[in-house]
């Protein structure tokens, strides 16, 4: 069974300082799946951020950068210049 596990449950971030979120894939090779990232905000709305390769949701391309690290079997999401509006719960997901 495939499992995607966040590296940290909580990530403290400073405004304007780049931050990195990581998800580790257990049981399978990450490169053979498409990785997706979403953000859930207070209104319980799930918003699409990124999908491999280089597909971004509206308004996310300039400040977010998605990637995978196949040598560590990780999905990575970088927030280049975090602000208060980036607060929320981030989810990684995969599909084929």
């Amino acid at each position: 069974a495939i499992e995607l596990v966040p590296e940290h449950q909580t990530v403290p971030v400073s405004i304007g300082v780049p931050a990195t979120l990581r998800c580790s894939m257990k049981g399978e090779a990450i490169g053979n799946y498409y990785i997706n990232w979403y953000r859930k905000t207070q209104g319980n709305t799930m918003t699409f951020i990124y999908r491999e390769k280089d597909i971004y949701g509206p308004g996310f391309k300039d400040n977010f950068q998605g990637d995978i690290d196949i040598a560590k079997n990780l999905a990575v999401l970088k927030i280049l210049a975090p602000s208060e509006r980036d607060e929320g719960s981030y989810y990684c997901a995969c599909d084929t």
Partner: antibody, heavy 122, light 112 residues
Framework: EVQLVESGPGLVQPSETLSLTCTVS????????WNWIRQPAGKGLEWIGR???????NYNPSLKSRLTMSLDTSKNQFSLKLNSVTAADTAVYYC????????????????WGQGTLVTVSS | QSVLTQAPSVSGAPGQRVTISCTGS?????????VKWYQQLPGTAPKLLIY???DRPSGVPDRFSGSKSGTSASLAITGLQAEDEADYYC????????????FGGGTKLTVL
């Protein structure tokens, strides 16, 4: 036993396109990463690029503008095309399987083809 | 010019112990990427000797061992045998580009 066999022309004209195919037997092409690596005579190994079973690719930046890799899961094959070749592209070309070992959390090349010599000359 | 640096050659007499070093940087070996070692006998394809810095695939004799510290790694061969004469390559990944594979330039081992 997993076997990888490279095939394609041994001689390519300068400025033409080098085309190679790697046929995989003994296991499915799914679940692994598939790579091309080359070695000029008497020199070291140079990674060319890889293709995933999603069709996504990673290319060596020094070759990226000339490189195309593709995958045919139905034939258990993957291919390399390198255009605008010069004498500097003369080398033994290897295809190799890259395996993610979840038990040891390591990624490595576990099976290689025997290699095929491609000479670029008129 | 290879990203990982290896001595071009090393030699030893049968029965001796030799080490082959591989030096990287903070963007590859030092970025917590593990090191693999491959043996290439004359006229053949490379063969995996060590993965995960220290692990040996089945069939590789325990005379071969690997280690890693900081931005460097080493391959040690004990009880040197004539059939160990080959080229040895270290390999890792580089954090600056997605999935970028880096090799050492290779070390030629001569058994005297």
């Amino acid at each position: 036993e997993v076997q990888l066999v490279e095939s394609g022309p041994g001689l390519v004209q300068p400025s033409e396109t080098l085309s190679l195919t790697c046929t995989v037997s003994g296991d499915s092409i799914r679940g692994y990463y598939w790579n091309w690596i080359r070695q000029p005579a008497g020199k070291g190994l140079e990674w060319i690029g890889r293709i995933f079973t999603t069709g996504n690719t990673n290319y060596n930046p020094s070759l990226k503008s000339r490189l195309t890799m593709s995958l045919d899961t139905s034939k258990n094959q993957f291919s390399l095309k390198l255009n605008s070749v010069t004498a500097a592209d003369t080398a033994v070309y290897y295809c190799a399987r890259e395996k993610w070992d979840s038990s040891s959390s390591a990624l490595y090349f576990d099976f290689w083809g025997q290699g095929t010599l491609v000479t670029v000359s008129s | 010019q290879s990203v990982l640096t290896q001595a071009p050659s090393v030699s030893g007499a049968p029965g001796q112990r030799v080490t082959i070093s591989c030096t990287g940087s903070s963007s590859n070996i030092g970025a917590d990427y593990d090191v693999k070692w491959y043996q290439q006998l004359p006229g053949t394809a490379p063969k995996l000797l060590i993965y995960g810095n220290t692990d040996r695939p089945s069939g590789v004799p325990d005379r071969f061992s690997g280690s890693k510290s900081g931005t460097s790694a080493s391959l040690a061969i004990t009880g040197l045998q004539a059939e160990d004469e080959a080229d040895y390559y270290c390999q890792s990944y580089d954090s600056r580009l997605t999935g970028y594979v880096v090799f050492g330039g290779g070390t030629k081992l001569t058994v005297l």
